[in-house]
């Protein structure tokens, strides 16, 4: 099918960075300034994204790829292709409608984004609290009395931090 199409459609020969110009007998013309085509055989070039205002340019637009944006310091990207900027908070806080608020007792957040998560419940694993939790850090679970035999491991590190409650980037 591809071979048949290329025989019939001269536009299929136009590479990325060009478009098939119907006004010029389907000649492959370069994309105009501030536009791009990321695949071959395009009949038009797409307008480059402009990273304006709080959206900063992370990667300039080229004839074959769109610009990429990120957010001004104090905010971070959210959504596909950094379609939104969301406020940073301090460690030990989470973002709410009312702005950044401290984590409630018994919860923590060790990042500038995401939500406060409950401290690990050491007793569920039959362990004791070795280091108390804070707003910024999870508890560290230590051995249960039965684990204090020679050669036993003395500390269980906390589970790796996850970041629930936010759209993927």
């Amino acid at each position: 099918f591809e071979r048949t199409r290329s025989l019939q459609d001269p536009c299929s020969n136009c590479p990325a960075g060009t478009f098939c110009d119907n006004n010029r007998n389907q000649i492959c013309s370069p994309c105009p300034p501030n536009s791009f085509s990321s695949a071959g055989g395009q009949r038009t070039c797409d307008i480059c994204r402009q990273c304006k205002g709080v959206f900063r340019t992370r990667k300039e637009c080229s004839s074959t790829s769109n610009a990429e944006c990120d957010c001004t310091p104090g905010f971070h990207c959210l959504g596909a292709g950094c379609s939104m900027c969301e406020q940073d908070c301090k460690q030990g806080q989470e973002l709410t409608k009312k702005g950044c608020k401290d984590c409630c007792f018994g919860t923590f957040n060790d990042q500038k984004r995401g939500i406060c998560r409950p401290w690990t419940n050491c007793s569920l694993d039959g362990k004791s609290v070795l280091v108390n939790g804070t707003k910024e850090r999870d508890v560290v679970c230590g051995p249960s009395p039965a684990d204090l035999s020679p050669g036993a491991s003395s500390v269980t590190p906390p589970a790796p931090a996850r970041e629930p409650g936010h759209s993927p980037q």
């Epitope: 709080v54 959210l78 959504g79 379609s83 939104m84 900027c85 969301e86 406020q87 973002l95 709410t96 409608k97 409650g165 936010h166 759209s167």
Partner: nanobody, 123 residues
């Protein structure tokens, strides 16, 4: 196209007042949370205030509570920020920003931003 245009900035003396406006076009203004965000010289962005679609909920950063008032007029597609008792710390570029789809539910991201209006508080 979708656009936000701020106005009303300027030079004001400490203790003075200003009212910022933001004119929205190209989208259904009454369907979105709206925000004011500012950037002081040499600093990062700071969220200032937000307002729900119908104006029934309004929230402020602690440093402006009792001095700034956010409001909106959905009939005029306009957002406002009344700023009283201004101090030098309020000197900044003020941006109007639209809360993205799902704002307040699973995120607080802002997807459309104005070009900003400059407020300078100085004697």
């Amino acid at each position: 196209q979708v656009q936000l245009v701020e106005s009303g900035g300027g030079l004001v003396q400490p203790g003075g007042s200003l009212r910022l406006s933001c004119a929205a076009s190209g989208f259904t203004f009454s369907s979105y949370w709206m925000n004011w965000v500012r950037q002081a010289p040499g600093k990062g962005l700071e969220w200032v205030a937000n307002i729900k679609q119908d104006g029934s909920e309004k929230y402020y950063v602690d440093s402006v509570k009792g001095r700034f008032t956010i409001s909106r007029d959905n009939a005029k597609n306009s957002l406002y920020l009344q700023m009283n008792s201004l101090t030098a710390e309020d000197t900044a570029v003020y941006y109007c920003a639209r809360g993205g789809e799902g704002y307040g539910d699973d995120h607080y991201g802002m997807d459309v931003w104005g070009q900003g209006t400059t407020v300078t508080v100085s004697s």
